[in-house]
Amino acid sequence: LQDLCSNCPAGTFCDNNRSQICSPCPPNSFSSAGGQRTCDICRQCKGVFKTRKECSSTSNAECDCISGYHCLGAECSMCEQDCKQGQELTKKGCKDCCFGTFNDQKRGICRPWTNCSLDGKSVLVNGTKERDVVCGPSPADLSPGASSATPPAPAREPGHSPQ
């Protein structure tokens, strides 16, 4: 016997109580694939979450975080407090990066400055709490009489100024 449910499109469910008629998903529910026997309840974005995309009969709602927070976890299942550039989030809140480390984002941890000498280069621009050091040519390249076919690359333009 053919399963009539396979004919039910996304946005509907196969209603066994009504002789396998395809019924539309009730309000606040969805089915993203055909042939479903139930519709899933839509996600609700409450508290620290805000709605990024409304639920439809064929797709779930998508959540984002309210201002001052950013998403963590699959499909934004958790929000984490933003910090300023030059800081990292600890158990006691936002703390400035220690000397020798930087963070150029509002999230994540402070990372150590690049050690230019490991690549045989010198420090062209000192690091800050918000920015990594910029490495320049090796000290040998800068010695008198040394010539270079190409000038040293300019210091990279910061993506955006620290807050």
Epitope: Q44, K46, G47, G73, A74, S77, E80
Partner: antibody, heavy 118, light 107 residues
């Protein structure tokens, strides 16, 4: 430190109402939401409703007709009222702070034990 | 409503062992799941949110995992103070719902 302290009656007659006050300290009700959850004797947890930092409320549909949650930010108090109590409303009632990271409960009150009996 | 099923009502373990408490959601809830510990006579205590993120102060012996419909709370190196009931909770949609609980007994 963060605390939620509950006060309310232990015994209520059938058809009467239950009022519980949850007084919070160590955080502001203008920043955090407060939920109410109950636990019948020897059973699991049941979510009743929440009042958010902006004063908006969400209720479990099963209780929406007889439940009211309000608050006073200035006194750091949340007020829970449930009408038309019956014997199966006998439970421990908890207030709990909403986590700042999700819709879960990161700190709980000590609980108010309610018995509904004549 | 989304039903959270904890099929094991009781689990028995010994100090130092590793134990896994499972929870199954009646539909896909992504990773919008939290876990709580309730010691006898006490209020519940938050352990995990977003399926795998430990709350501050929770020992790293407690680990959450899973997504979609199947979730697990693993306690490694079980201690006597872990004698408690453990509940899962979904926050995908209202009403927020809990599992019926799993009681951990220490031999």
């Amino acid at each position: 430190q963060v605390q939620l302290k509950q006060s309310g009656p232990g015994l209520v007659q059938p058809s009467q109402s239950l009022s519980i006050t949850c007084t919070v300290s160590g955080f502001s009700l203008t920043t955090y939401g407060v939920h109410w959850v109950r636990q019948p004797p020897g059973k699991g947890l049941e979510w009743l409703g929440v009042i958010w930092s902006d004063g908006n409320t969400d209720y479990n549909d099963a209780f929406i007709s007889r439940l009211s949650i309000t608050k006073d930010n200035s006194t750091s108090q949340v007020f829970f009222k449930m009408n038309g109590l019956q014997a199966d409303d006998t439970a421990i009632y908890y207030c709990a702070r909403n986590s700042i990271t999700s819709v879960s409960f990161d700190c709980w009150g000590q609980g108010t034990t309610l018995t509904v009996s004549s | 409503d989304i039903v959270m099923t904890q099929s094991q009502k009781f689990m028995s373990t010994s100090v130092g062992d590793r134990v896994s408490v499972t929870c199954k959601a009646s539909q896909n809830v992504g990773t919008t799941v939290a876990w709580y510990q309730q010691r006898p006579g006490q209020s519940p205590k938050a352990l995990i949110c977003s399926a795998s993120y430990r709350y501050s102060g929770v020992p790293d012996r407690f680990t959450g995992s899973g997504s979609g419909t199947d979730f697990t709370l693993t306690i490694s190196n079980v201690q006597s103070e872990d004698l408690a009931e453990y509940f899962c909770q979904q926050y995908n949609s209202y009403p927020l719902t809990f599992g019926s609980g799993t009681k951990l007994e220490i031999k």
